[in-house]
């Protein structure tokens, strides 16, 4: 099938980095500047992606592969192939319709991206709050309140103090 295809379609012989030029008897012409073809047999070359503004060039365009972009400092990539650049916020904030805003009470964000999430509800697991939550950190859950009742402590009691003047046996 490949042989018959190449006999019927001279374009199939055009390698990546070229295109099959209908205006020149279907000969293989190199992709013009700022364009590429990543596969053989193409009738056109694709325009190279341009990394402008908040997008920075991570990899230059070549005749056989598109440019790749990342984001300028203070922004992070979103989407496949860094299709978007989104502003970083501080920990304890989220990006809203009006920019970076502090997390509401009862929520936190420990990253420079993403949304504020509710603190863990320790009581759902039958535990108590060991360390309070902040805008930047989730609460830390500790043992259940029952575990902390008198006589039920799991903490090892300190060794009894020796009387003065007694040396270890």
């Amino acid at each position: 099938f490949e042989r018959t295809r190449s006999l019927q379609d001279p374009c199939s012989n055009c390698p990546a980095g070229t295109f099959c030029d209908n205006n020149r008897n279907q000969i293989c012409s190199p992709c013009p500047p700022n364009s590429f073809s990543s596969a053989g047999g193409q009738r056109t070359c694709d325009i190279c992606r341009q990394c402008k503004g908040v997008f920075r060039t991570r990899k230059e365009c070549s005749s056989t592969s598109n440019a790749e972009c990342d984001c300028t400092p203070g922004f992070h990539c979103l989407g496949a192939g860094c299709s978007m650049c989104e502003q970083d916020c501080k920990q304890g904030q989220e990006l809203t319709k009006k920019g970076c805003k502090d997390c509401c009470f009862g929520t936190f964000n420990d990253q420079k991206r993403g949304i504020c999430r509710p603190w863990t509800n320790c009581s759902l697991d039958g535990k108590s709050v060991l360390v309070n939550g902040t805008k930047e950190r989730d609460v830390v859950c500790g043992p259940s309140p029952a575990d902390l009742s008198p006589g039920a402590s799991s903490v090892t009691p300190p060794a009894p103090a020796r009387e003065p003047g007694h040396s270890p046996q």
Epitope: G53, C82, M84, C85, Q87, L95, T96, K97
Partner: nanobody
Framework: EVDLVESGGGLVQPGGSLRLSCAAS????????MSWARQVPGKGFEWVAY???????YYADSVKGRFTISRDNAKDTVYLHMNSLKFEDMAVYYC????????????????WGQGTQVTVSS
């Protein structure tokens, strides 16, 4: 071909004013939300102001009350009126389309101008 050309930058004293313009061509300007962003050397980009196709606006806290973004759909131009300029406003200012319409976010199909320098100096 899409083109955005900024103008109006220059040298101004603290407390002074400037009006930046961004002339657009190659797309249906009135249908697009537009943005101004700035880049301070060594500090990266920050968004400054946005204007929707219907004329509603958003401003960064750092420029609120001092800067005004506006658009003239008949002239395919977006403006940034800058008053009470401060030393910290010194930057290269860029005009860009704003397809995502999410503050602080641009996508790969947005178009950017070449930028215009604003220098604040006494």
């Amino acid at each position: 071909e899409v083109d955005l050309v900024e103008s109006g930058g220059g040298l101004v004293q603290p407390g002074g004013s400037l009006r930046l313009s961004c002339a657009a061509s190659g797309f249906t300007f009135r249908s697009y939300a537009m943005s101004w962003a700035r880049q301070v050397p060594g500090k990266g980009f920050e968004w400054v102001a946005y204007i929707y196709s219907d004329g509603s606006t958003y401003y960064a806290d750092s420029v609120k009350g001092r800067f005004t973004i506006s658009r003239d759909n008949a002239k395919d131009t977006v403006y940034l009126h800058m008053n009470s300029l401060k030393f910290e406003d010194m930057a290269v200012y860029y005009c860009a389309t704003w397809r995502s319409q999410q503050v602080g976010r641009w996508d790969e199909y947005d178009h950017w101008g070449q930028g215009t320098q604003v220098t604040v100096s006494s």
